[in-house]
């Protein structure tokens, strides 16, 4: 039962995480205009991975895509690549993990196959989460570097008379969404890997019971162990399935809380 719950929870957490990574990648607010010196501005700038936007006091918002590919900073390209790799791996991981879920029966799929698929999806989620965290961190580092560079020459005066105020950018909402989402995907992946560890040995123990008629098998056959690992009767399996579903429902209440925060 614990394994199923862990697997189900890992799946849901990863699902939320990947949804968050996709959201962060699409968001325009990766960097936002720093308002420290001017908390109330009539023109507010913010930038994403794909376009930059300007919101005027009038409410008019204008966004322009980065239509060049070669003219973009290498770091931005790297961040884009990391986020896309994260999404692709996460999506494949989700697909694999759906079939790996214990509560889903697909033909006569062996539990060892499910264990392998759980491990595979877990690793994919871990790598996906790491890609997202890396991408967001690289962008954040780029922002910090640019921030201090623009602070150093904040005002480039012409004869001290005319001032050109350089726009400084600070962390946007997408960075925090990305970090949290990456973390959730990572946690989900770890949970899947833990669930896999629970799946694999019990399968071996179950086969051992089939093949050995000696007293050895009795030593490996305590009911408590079998019940806890979910290999009892059909009724026990049904209960585990319900438990898993209940856990998933509980986890599904998290996104609303997360969105609210």
């Amino acid at each position: 039962m614990a394994v199923t719950a862990c697997q189900g929870l890992g799946f849901v957490v990863s699902l939320i995480g990947i949804a968050g990574i996709i959201a962060a990648t699409c968001m325009d607010q990766w960097s936002t205009q720093d308002l420290y010196n001017n908390p109330v501005t009539a023109v507010f700038n913010y930038q994403g991975l794909w376009r930059s936007c300007v919101r005027e006091s009038s409410g008019f918002t204008e966004c322009r895509g980065y239509f060049t590919l070669l003219g973009l900073p290498a770091m931005l390209q790297a961040v884009r690549a990391l986020m896309i790799v994260g999404i692709v791996l996460g999506a494949i991981g989700l697909l694999v993990s759906i079939f790996a879920l214990k509560c889903i029966r697909i033909g006569s799929m062996e539990d060892s196959a499910k264990a392998n698929m759980t491990l595979t999806s877990g690793i994919m989620f871990i790598v996906s989460g790491l890609c997202a965290i890396a991408g967001v961190s690289v962008f954040a580092n780029m922002l910090v570097t640019n921030f201090w560079m623009s602070t150093a020459n904040m005002y480039t005066g012409m004869g001290g008379m005319v001032q050109t105020v350089q726009t400084r950018y600070t962390f946007g909402a997408a960075l925090f969404v990305g970090w949290v989402a990456g973390g959730l995907t990572l946690i989900g992946g770890v949970m899947m890997c833990i669930a896999c560890r629970g799946l694999a040995p019990e399968e071996t123990n179950y086969k051992a019971v089939s093949y050995h008629a000696s007293g050895h098998s009795v030593a490996y056959k305590p009911g408590g162990f079998k019940a806890s690992t979910g290999f009892g009767s059909n009724t026990k399996n049904k209960k585990i399935y319900d438990g898993g579903a209940r856990t998933e429902d509980e986890v599904q209440s998290y996104p609303s809380k997360h969105d609210y925060v």
Partner: antibody, heavy 118, light 113 residues
């Protein structure tokens, strides 16, 4: 079409307050920011402040902060500008205008003349 | 606050001739995010409210005759009337639309010679 209609001329005594209204029609009132501008006779334009009717956010020129209060009543699509502690130098025409693309004021009303005299 | 300085304060031009009004700001009005200059030009005739002519330094408002054009970037801007018409006699104002408080130039009075 978009139209702004202001209240009539006002004559006030020094120290009193005046509340000028600006009724909007021809568009969704909460869609556009309303700005207030002062113009003394034969002189230039002076920005007082702006109000965002949707959320009620207001921004004021430092010169008018504390004396001018901008409000909006969404139910009757009307913006108000109240100026307190009136002085003789407040004698002017007060305009309300809609802020549009480019933060440009592209619809103006005819203005309300406020005269402060003892 | 951004200070807007217009020159000349008054200008007399013959009908059909070109009129040029300059406006200088104490700070750049160029927004790096969209590479637009937040400078607006208005025309005001006696007894009337101002009328929007040009925004973003060079974008003509719809309905404004094409003899009116705006140019410039950063801190120096120009309003040009290519061929003065009798109805163009008015006071012209430039305005900083970039930062609070929005500030206006002192105005340029355009008269016919």
């Amino acid at each position: 079409q978009v139209q702004l209609v202001q209240s009539g001329a006002e004559v006030k005594k020094p120290g009193a307050s005046v509340k000028v209204s600006c009724k909007a029609s021809g568009y969704t009132f909460t869609s556009y920011v309303i700005n207030w501008v002062k113009q003394k006779t034969g002189q230039g334009l002076e920005w007082i402040g702006e109000i965002h009717p949707r959320g009620g956010n207001t921004y004021y020129s430092e010169k008018f902060r504390g004396r001018a209060t901008l409000t909006a009543d969404k139910s009757i699509s009307t913006a108000y500008m109240e100026l307190s502690s009136l002085r003789s130098e407040d004698t002017a025409v007060y305009f309300c205008a809609i802020l549009r693309r480019g933060n440009a004021m592209d619809y103006w009303d005819q203005g309300t003349t406020v005269t402060v005299s003892s | 606050d951004i200070v807007m300085t217009q020159s000349p304060s008054s200008l007399a031009v013959s009908l059909g001739e070109m009129a040029t009004i300059n406006c200088k700001s104490s700070q750049s009005l160029l927004n790096s995010g969209n590479q637009r200059n937040y400078l607006t030009w208005y025309q005001q005739k006696p007894g009337q409210p101002p009328k929007l002519l040009i925004y973003w330094a060079s974008t003509r408002e719809s309905g404004v005759p094409d003899r009116f054009s705006g140019s410039g970037s950063g801190t120096d801007f120009t309003l040009t009337i290519s061929s003065l018409q009798a109805e163009d006699v008015a006071v012209y104002y430039c305005q900083n639309s970039y930062n609070y408080p929005y500030t206006f130039g002192q105005g340029t009075k355009l008269e016919r010679k």
